[in-house]
Interface confidence: medium
């Protein structure tokens, strides 16, 4: 068999939410991969599994199943969103997401994720992690092509 | 290392008010929650109230309400709870914990507070 | 208000085996960021809690493996892989999802 390509493209969105009682932030992150089948049969996506994290916690985790088949030779673009919460200890973040005064509120996020492919009863996991900024003082929609400069080489922890 | 410091066993008469202290060291004081936590003896644990010492805001468990104040001071790196009109119900163990790294995930070794005519 | 439910005792157990503590929450810990904040504290006697577990699973900083945790969004079991004399006091497990935060009455762990 030929490789199965996984390649993470990078954050597509992410919608903000506050609770102030709370000093709570709901970040809903929609982030985007690309799959490749260099194959010449086609291949099942069963199942991709997600997690973020910030300062080494994980704020979320999401799990989608039965995804998509790709074809023979076929590329396939898959959004998949992870609900995220930024409280408790890390409370200290509510202000600096919601303080006026601040115009960028870019936090470095981890995202890691999992894809998991079948083919003729084979399975086979391929993972990835990347170093995001993400906004959490607004919602945002990023290009892809800004995908670049969203990539953190060097995150500060 | 974090540590968190309360002061002294308090013996109170009924009707009085009485301040506990919790001195915080080895982090940033003004980033982390303090909650007070309630032991009676031989008891379990009661969650009071939080307060956020970075702004001071608070939040209080309604069967608290009135009997706890929580105040926090950034310069000294203490914070405070006020426990006021005393009465045998509140004769406890006080403890102070906070939020750093985790959830009540250091706590203050306790105060014992009685209250006796 | 999330109420913790805790049996008060544990069954006895051997030093050396293994023992198990229960918890039961009154709704559903598990968020829809697919975290549960269940917590899992010990008092030994004479001293203040410390935590052991955090988000149902996760041991926290210093604890030995020994211990261990899992469940449901509402059930929830502590296990103590081998009982050491150290190990004796008071589990109690809350719950960290809502405000108030709640705690479990406590289950006092015995040693026959």
């Known amino acids: 068999p030929r490789s199965i390509e996984v390649k993470y493209i990078g954050v597509k969105s992410a919608y903000v939410s506050y609770d102030a009682e709370k000093r709570t932030i709901y970040l809903n992150i929609t982030n985007t991969l690309n799959i490749t089948n260099n194959n010449y049969y086609s291949v099942e996506v069963e199942n991709i599994t997600a997690q973020v994290q910030f300062s080494k916690t994980v704020i979320g985790k999401a799990r989608l199943n039965n995804i998509t088949n790709i074809g023979p030779l076929d590329m396939k673009q898959i959004d998949y969103t992870v609900p995220t919460v930024i409280a408790e200890e890390m409370s200290y973040m509510y202000d600096f997401c919601t303080l006026l005064s601040i115009k960028v509120h870019n936090i470095v996020l981890m995202m890691q994720v999992t894809v998991t492919t079948a083919y003729f009863g084979h399975s086979e996991q391929i993972s990835q992690e990347r170093y995001q900024y993400v906004d959490c003082g607004r919602n945002t929609t990023y290009q892809l092509a800004q995908s670049e400069y969203l990539n953190v080489l060097q995150p500060q922890q | 290392q974090v540590q968190l410091r309360q002061s002294g066993a308090e013996l109170v008469r009924p009707g009085a008010s009485v301040k506990l202290s919790c001195k915080a060291s080895?982090?940033?004081?003004?980033?982390?929650?303090i909650n007070w936590v309630k032991q009676r003896p031989g008891q379990g644990l009661e969650w009071i109230a939080r307060?956020?010492?970075?702004?001071?805001?608070?939040y209080y468990n309604e069967k608290f309400k009135g009997k706890a104040t929580l105040t926090a001071e950034g310069s000294s790196n203490t914070a405070y709870m006020q426990l006021s009109s005393l009465t045998s119900e509140d004769s406890a163990v006080y403890f102070c914990?906070?939020?750093?790294?985790?959830?009540?995930?250091?706590w203050g070794q306790g105060t014992l507070v009685t209250v006796s005519a | 208000d999330i109420v913790m439910t805790q049996a008060a005792f544990s069954n006895p157990v051997t030093l050396g085996t293994s023992a198990s503590i229960s918890c039961r929450s009154s709704?559903?810990?598990?968020?829809?960021?697919?975290?549960?904040?269940l917590y899992w504290y010990l008092q030994k006697p004479g001293q203040s809690p410390q935590l052991l577990i955090y988000q149902m699973s996760n041991l926290a900083s210093g604890v030995p493996d020994r211990f261990s945790s899992s469940g449901s969004g509402t059930d929830f079991t502590l296990r103590i892989s081998r009982v050491e004399a150290e190990d004796v006091g008071v589990y109690y497990c809350?719950?960290?999802?809502?405000?108030?935060?709640?705690f479990g009455g406590g289950t006092k762990l015995e040693i026959k």
């Open positions: 080895g982090y940033t004081f003004t980033d982390y929650y």
């Open positions: 809350a719950q960290n999802l809502e405000l108030p935060y709640t």
């Open positions: 709704k559903s810990l598990l968020h829809y960021n697919g975290i549960t904040y």
């Open positions: 914990a906070n939020h750093y790294t985790n959830p009540f995930a250091y």
């Open positions: 307060i956020y010492p970075g702004s001071g805001y608070t």
